[in-house]
């Protein structure tokens, strides 16, 4: 039985060359958190070990920068960048939570003049 | 061999303060959640508060009764937790045991102890 | 917060008997949230049965636990000498995290 339920920043967009916090929160249950994984599509970005701390993966060492907390910050955005993201949650004893983030890139002058998504 | 050692308990006054210390060695100590837990004369055990790890930003909980009164927090780089009791009761008389809990790996470990007696 | 009730509240036997002894939650708790500390006098409880039914490293096998939703039971297939002392139940499934009041298992 798990009980626990992830909070995530939901939709959310940002400029292209701009940078961006994705973050999640497990709430609602007392299980112990070993592990958090970032992932893009089927892409490893970053992992927060309890234990261990961060480790980023080398494709993304320049534009992915740990934290703040469990989250990750994405630098130097590009129009590419625009996607779902996941946190993935491994706990002890539950299991596995898995959060959805759906990062939107604008243009510069779109975002200024009409982004479909704020950024809280 | 893991060992912990509670001190800093003692005979106080109704309203008056204690500080508990709990000192840990044999293990590292900052990969492991810590409890305290009491045991009134003669009576059951009683969760009292925990604090997570720095992964966990140091998340603390406490048993209602201590809410306000009771502050747990640790050391990492002293390899100590501490319990501050202010605003002690009659009803705080207890052995406090202070206790290691590293879910994921079933390890378990309780001090011997330390007696507080709150009597005018 | 979860109520853990033990029963009975002591429990008197003779050694090569089994022993069963109940642990009823006010809400289910997820086996995994399940543990069983023993404890002897003077000294500080010691984690006897996590997880519901494993046993914490060096407890012989004629312990064992089962239980699910509220339901929980630790059983002793044939009690030694060493055996008696209060059994307590616990849960970490929610805070705060709780006791039952505890089991004596007492030599009749």
């Known amino acids: 039985m798990m009980t626990g339920t992830i909070e995530t920043t939901g939709n959310i967009s940002a400029e292209k060359g701009g940078s961006i916090i994705l973050q999640c929160h497990l709430s609602s249950t007392t299980a112990q958190v070993t592990q958090v994984n970032w992932e893009q599509q089927d892409q490893l970005l970053a992992i927060c070990n309890a234990d261990l701390g961060w480790h980023i993966s080398p494709s993304f060492k320049d534009r992915v920068a740990p934290g703040p907390g469990l989250g990750l910050t994405l630098q130097s955005l590009t129009v590419n960048d625009t996607g779902e993201y996941f946190c993935i949650y491994h706990t002890y004893p539950d299991g596995t939570y898995t959060g959805r983030i759906f990062l939107e890139v604008l243009e510069s002058s779109v975002a200024e003049h009409g982004a479909r998504f704020q950024i809280p | 061999e893991v060992q912990l050692v509670e001190s800093g308990g003692g005979l106080v006054q109704p309203g008056g303060s204690l500080r508990l210390s709990c000192a840990a060695s044999?293990?590292?100590?900052?990969?492991?959640?810590m409890n305290w837990v009491r045991q009134a004369p003669g009576k059951g055990l009683e969760w009292v508060a925990e604090?997570?790890?720095?992964?966990?930003?140091?998340?603390?909980h406490y048993v209602e009764s201590v809410k306000g009164r009771f502050t747990i927090s640790r050391d990492d780089s002293k390899n100590s937790v501490y319990l501050q009791m202010n605003s002690l009761k009659t009803e705080d008389t207890a052995v406090y045991y202070c206790?290691?809990?590293?879910?994921?790996?079933?390890?378990?470990?309780w001090g011997r102890g330390t007696l507080v007696t709150v009597s005018s | 917060e979860i109520v853990l009730t033990q029963s009975p509240a002591t429990l008197s036997l003779s050694p090569g008997e089994r022993a069963t002894l109940s642990c009823s939650a006010s809400?289910?708790?997820?086996?995994?949230?399940l543990y069983w500390y023993q404890q002897k006098p003077g000294l500080a409880p010691r984690l006897w049965i996590y997880?519901?039914?494993d046993l914490a490293s060096g407890i012989p096998d004629r312990f064992s636990g089962s239980g699910s939703g509220t339901d929980y039971t630790l059983t002793i297939s044939r009690l030694e000498p060493e055996d008696f002392a209060v059994y307590y139940c616990?849960?970490?499934?929610?805070?705060?995290?709780?006791f039952g009041q505890g089991t004596k298992l007492e030599i009749k």
């Open positions: 997880s519901t039914s």
């Open positions: 604090i997570r790890l720095k992964f966990n930003d140091y998340a603390t």
């Open positions: 206790t290691m809990v590293r879910r994921n790996w079933y390890f378990d470990v």
């Open positions: 616990h849960q970490w499934s929610s805070y705060p995290y709780t």
């Open positions: 809400s289910s708790v997820s086996s995994g949230y």
């Open positions: 044999g293990v590292t100590f900052s990969n492991y959640w």
